[in-house]
C-alpha cells in the first residue's frame, strides 16, 4: 500500500537557527521515510532534507540548517513519503520567510516609574540579538497587578533599530506593583517569540484613593446616647500598596453644623456616642501626598422608620464559593451592604462587611470562611443615603458532625414512661445546622429502640416501657454530616406508680 499523501504541511523559520517543517500523518502503518524538497533563494536554488531512515518513531518533521537559510526569501516545500510500495508526494507549498519567522524573546531590564508622572511605568528592554537588524518588530506587552491572575495586553510596534528600547505604559493604578512580560515578532510574521522573563515595577504613590464607610447601630444607653461603631476600609479598587497615615472624622446633627465634632485616629474603626437625632458622619484618609475624597454616612434618627424591600434570601454552596441571593420589591435599589460574622455565644471577634452594586447576589470564596462555623449574614438595602431594614440568614461553608452530643437527663420516671430532657449543644460545638435529634434507648439485655424528633424539640416523653426495668439511653444530635451521641444515662422504671402507692399508704 502506498503511503498516505503528506498533508497539513506547516513550516517555521527559527531565525538564524533552522527552518523546520512538519506534516501529517505523523505515523504510518508500514515503515515510511520522507524527503522534503525545497527551492530557495527565490527559486534559484533547490535541495532536500531527508528524515533519518533509522528513526522508526514519529519523524514527520525535517529541518534545514544554516548556511543555506537566507532571509528575506521565498521557499517552496514539497514532502515525498516513500515506503516499499512507492512514493506519494504532497502538494507544493509556498513560504515567505518573513511571514513565518520566529525570533528570541526580548529581555526586559527595567520597569520603573518616571518621577512626577502619575500612574505610568516605563518599560525598557533589549531587542533580541537574534532578530533581523533592519526589520520592524511588533510587540505584545502583558501586565497584571502582582496579586491578580488576569493579564492585560497592549500591542505596539518599534521601527527603530536602537538596541535599548522603551515603552510608556499609562492609565495604571497608583502605588501598585505590576508584573510585566514582553514578546515580539517581525511585523509580517505570524509567529511570536516566547514571553520574556517577568519583571516587576511599582507606580508612584498618590493621595489615598477613597474609603468605604459603614456602621453598626447599637441599642441606646440608659442616658439616651446611642453607641455607633464606625468602620471603614480602603475603597474597592484602591491600590493594594496604599497606606494611610491617619483618618479624620467629623460629624454633626442634621441641619446643625455648628455642633460639628472632629476626631483623628489611626485605627480603621471608631465608636461614636450620638444623640437620638439624625447625624451626618464624614471620614477622609490621608498620607504625605494629600487626602482621599470624603466618605459620607447618614445615621438615622432613633425613631426613624426604615424601609423594607428584601422579600427573601437564599444561601447556597457551589464547588468553592458561598453564594447569597436575595429578591427585592424595590427595583430602584441597586446598592446593598452585606455583613457577615461568626455566630458565636460570645461577642463576635471578626466582623466583615462589603458593598454590592448592580447585583442581587454576593459571593465569597469558601476558603475565606472557617469550616464548621456558623455565619450570620445580613444584607441591607441602600438607596442614596438611606439604609433599609436588613434581611438575615445563616450559613455554613462546610458542616461536620457535632463535637459533642446533647447533655441529657431523665425526669418524671414512671412505671412505663419517662420524660427525657436535653440541652442545646453550644454554638461552638454544633459544626452544622442541627436537623434532628434521635433518642436511642434499650432495656437491659433487650432490643434497642430509637425515636427521631425535630431540632426544635428538647424534651420527649417515652411510653410503653417495661415496669421495674433498667434502661440505658442517649440522645444523638445530627447535622447534614452525621450525628454525635450525648452522654449515656441510665434509669429504672418504677414497679408501682407513685400515685397508686400513696393511695395505698393512706389505708
Amino acid at each position: 500500500v502506498l503511503p498516505a499523501k503528506p498533508e497539513n504541511i506547516s513550516c517555521i523559520f527559527y531565525y538564524e537557527e533552522n527552518f523546520t517543517c512538519t506534516w501529517s500523518p505523523e505515523k504510518e502503518a508500514s515503515y515510511t521515510w520522507y524527503k522534503v524538497k525545497r527551492t530557495y533563494s527565490y527559486g534559484y536554488k533547490s535541495d532536500i532534507c531527508s528524515t533519518d531512515n533509522s528513526t522508526r518513531g514519529n519523524h514527520a518533521s525535517c529541518s534545514f540548517l544554516p548556511p543555506t537559510i537566507t532571509n528575506p526569501d521565498n521557499y517552496t516545500i514539497q514532502v515525498e513519503a516513500q515506503n516499499a510500495d512507492g512514493i506519494m508526494k504532497s502538494d507544493i507549498t509556498y513560504w515567505n520567510l518573513d511571514a513565518i519567522m520566529k525570533i528570541e524573546p526580548p529581555e526586559i531590564f527595567s520597569v520603573k516609574s518616571v518621577l512626577g508622572i502619575k500612574r505610568m511605568l516605563q518599560i525598557k528592554w533589549i531587542r533580541p540579538v537574534l532578530a533581523p537588524h533592519s526589520s520592524t518588530l511588533k510587540y505584545t506587552l502583558r501586565f497584571r497587578t502582582i496579586n491578580s491572575a488576569y493579564w492585560m495586553e497592549v500591542n505596539f510596534t518599534k521601527e527603530d533599530i536602537d538596541r535599548d528600547e522603551t515603552y510608556n505604559l499609562t492609565e495604571l493604578q497608583a502605588f501598585t506593583e505590576y508584573v510585566m512580560t514582553l514578546r515580539c515578532a517581525p511585523a509580517e510574521s505570524m509567529f511570536w517569540s516566547g514571553w520574556s522573563q517577568e519583571k516587576v515595577g511599582t507606580t508612584e504613590e498618590e493621595a489615598p484613593y477613597g474609603l468605604d464607610l459603614w456602621r453598626v447601630l447599637k441599642p441606646a444607653m440608659v442616658d439616651g446616647r446611642r453607641p455607633v461603631q464606625l468602620m471603614w476600609k480602603k475603597a474597592t479598587g484602591a491600590p493594594v500598596l496604599e497606606k494611610a497615615l491617619g483618618y479624620n472624622i467629623w460629624y454633626f446633627p442634621e441641619n446643625n453644623t455648628n455642633l460639628t465634632e472632629t476626631v483623628n485616629t489611626t485605627n480603621q474603626t471608631h465608636e461614636l456616642y450620638l444623640g437620638g437625632k439624625t447625624y451626618w458622619v464624614y471620614v477622609v484618609s490621608y498620607n504625605s501626598l494629600g487626602e482621599s475624597p470624603v466618605a459620607t454616612l447618614r445615621i438615622p434618627a432613633l425613631n426613624e422608620k426604615t424601609f423594607q424591600c428584601i422579600e427573601a434570601m437564599q444561601a447556597c454552596l457551589t464547588q468553592d464559593q458561598l453564594v447569597v441571593e436575595w429578591q427585592s420589591s424595590a427595583p430602584e435599589v441597586d446598592t446593598w451592604m452585606v455583613e457577615w460574622f461568626p455566630d458565636v455565644d460570645s461577642e463576635p471577634s471578626s466582623f466583615s462587611w462589603e458593598s454590592v452594586s448592580q447585583a442581587r447576589n454576593w459571593t465569597i470564596q469558601k476558603d475565606e470562611l472557617k469550616p464548621l462555623w456558623c455565619y450570620n449574614i445580613s444584607v441591607y438595602p441602600v438607596l442614596r443615603d438611606r439604609v433599609g431594614q436588613p434581611y438575615s440568614t445563616q450559613a455554613y461553608v462546610q458542616e461536620g458532625i457535632p463535637s459533642a452530643g446533647p447533655v441529657t437527663q431523665a425526669d418524671s420516671i414512671g412505671v412505663k414512661t419517662v420524660t427525657i430532657t436535653w440541652k442545646e449543644i453550644p454554638k461552638s460545638k454544633r459544626n452544622g445546622f442541627i436537623k434532628n435529634y434521635t433518642i436511642f434507648y434499650q432495656a437491659e439485655d433487650g432490643k434497642e429502640f430509637s425515636k427521631t424528633v425535630n431540632s426544635n424539640i428538647l424534651q420527649y416523653r417515652l411510653e410503653s416501657l417495661t415496669r421495674r426495668t433498667s434502661y440505658s439511653l442517649q440522645v444523638m444530635a445530627s447535622t447534614n454530616a452525621g450525628g454525635t451521641n450525648g452522654t449515656k444515662i441510665n434509669f429504672k422504671t418504677l414497679s408501682i406508680s407513685h400515685h397508686h402507692h400513696h393511695h395505698h399508704h393512706h389505708h
Epitope: 527551492t39 533563494s41 527565490y42 534559484y44 532536500i48 514539497q78 507544493i92
Partner: antibody, heavy 117, light 112 residues
Framework: EVQLVESGGGLVQPGRSMKLSCTAS????????MAWVRQAPTKGLEWVAS????????YYRDSVKGRFTISRDNAKSTLYLQMDSLRAEDTATYYC??????????WGQGVMVTVSS | QFTLTQPKSVSGSLRSTITIPCERS????????VSWYQQHLGRPPINVIY?????PSEVSDRFSGSIDSSSNSASLTITNLQMDDEADYFC???????????FGGGTKLTVL
C-alpha cells in the same frame, strides 16, 4: 502580462566588449532572481549567469567567469550582461529569463551576439 | 558537477505516445527538481514541466513528467502526439554543489 525584451546584440570583434539589456514588465522585478541563458547556433541551451533579487549575489558558468558581469537596476526593472574579452565561442542567441522554483518560467525573445573578425 | 544526458533524437507517429529520458550522471535525480522546456525552431524555449511532474496551467495535459530513482533519470512523456509537438526538448536541474542550473543536451522530437 509578463514580458522580457532583450536589446544590445549585434556583431562584435573578438576581444571587444558588448552590453546586453533586458527590460522587464508585468511583474515585480525586484522579487525575482534573473538569468541569462544562451544558445549557440544549432546547439543546446547553456546557462550563463544569474543574479539575486537585490543584486548582491551573482553566479556564473566557469567559461565566462571574470569576463562577463551580470547586474540589475530594480528601479528601472532592467537586467544587464556586460560581456568583455569576447571570444568566437560566445557567439549565440542570448535569452533573458526569470527564475522561479528551480526553473525558468518566462523567457525573452532572445538577442543575437556574433563574435567575429 | 553532474551532467544531464538526453538522446539526440526521438520520433513517434501521430497520436502515439513517446517518452524522452534525462539521466543524471552523479548524485540523486530526486535531490533537485527537474524541469522540461519545449523549443520550436527560431523561438525561445517555453516551460512545459516544472518540479518533476507539475504542469503549467496553459500546457496541454498530454505532457507529463516523472522521475525514476532506480535509473536515476527523469522522463517527459507526451501522449497523443500532434504535429505541433515536433520541437527540441531540454531537461534542466540544479547542481547544489556548485550552485548552478544545468541543462541537458536536448532531444529533437520528430512526429512521423
Amino acid at each position: 502580462e509578463v514580458q522580457l525584451v532583450e536589446s544590445g546584440g549585434g556583431l562584435v570583434q573578438p576581444g571587444r566588449s558588448m552590453k546586453l539589456s533586458c527590460t522587464a514588465s508585468g511583474f515585480t522585478f525586484s522579487n525575482y532572481y534573473m538569468a541569462w541563458v544562451r544558445q549557440a547556433p544549432t546547439k543546446g541551451l547553456e546557462w550563463v549567469a544569474s543574479i539575486s533579487t537585490g543584486g548582491g549575489n551573482t553566479y556564473y558558468r566557469d567559461s565566462v567567469k571574470g569576463r562577463f558581469t551580470i547586474s540589475r537596476d530594480n528601479a528601472k526593472s532592467t537586467l544587464y550582461l556586460q560581456m568583455d574579452s569576447l571570444r568566437a565561442e560566445d557567439t549565440a542567441t542570448y535569452y533573458c529569463a526569470r527564475h522561479t522554483m528551480g526553473y525558468f518560467d518566462y523567457w525573452g525573445q532572445g538577442v543575437m551576439v556574433t563574435v567575429s573578425s | 558537477q553532474f551532467t544531464l544526458t538526453q538522446p539526440k533524437s526521438v520520433s513517434g507517429s501521430l497520436r502515439s505516445t513517446i517518452t524522452i529520458p534525462c539521466e543524471r550522471s552523479s548524485g540523486d535525480i530526486g535531490d533537485n527538481y527537474v524541469s522540461w522546456y519545449q523549443q520550436h525552431l527560431g523561438r525561445p524555449p517555453i516551460n512545459v514541466i516544472y518540479a518533476d511532474d507539475q504542469r503549467p496551467s496553459e500546457v496541454s495535459d498530454r505532457f507529463s513528467g516523472s522521475i525514476d530513482s532506480s535509473s536515476n533519470s527523469a522522463s517527459l512523456t507526451i501522449t497523443n502526439l500532434q504535429m505541433d509537438d515536433e520541437a527540441d526538448y531540454f531537461c534542466q536541474s540544479y547542481d547544489g554543489k556548485i550552485e548552478i542550473p544545468v541543462f541537458g543536451g536536448g532531444t529533437k522530437l520528430t512526429v512521423l
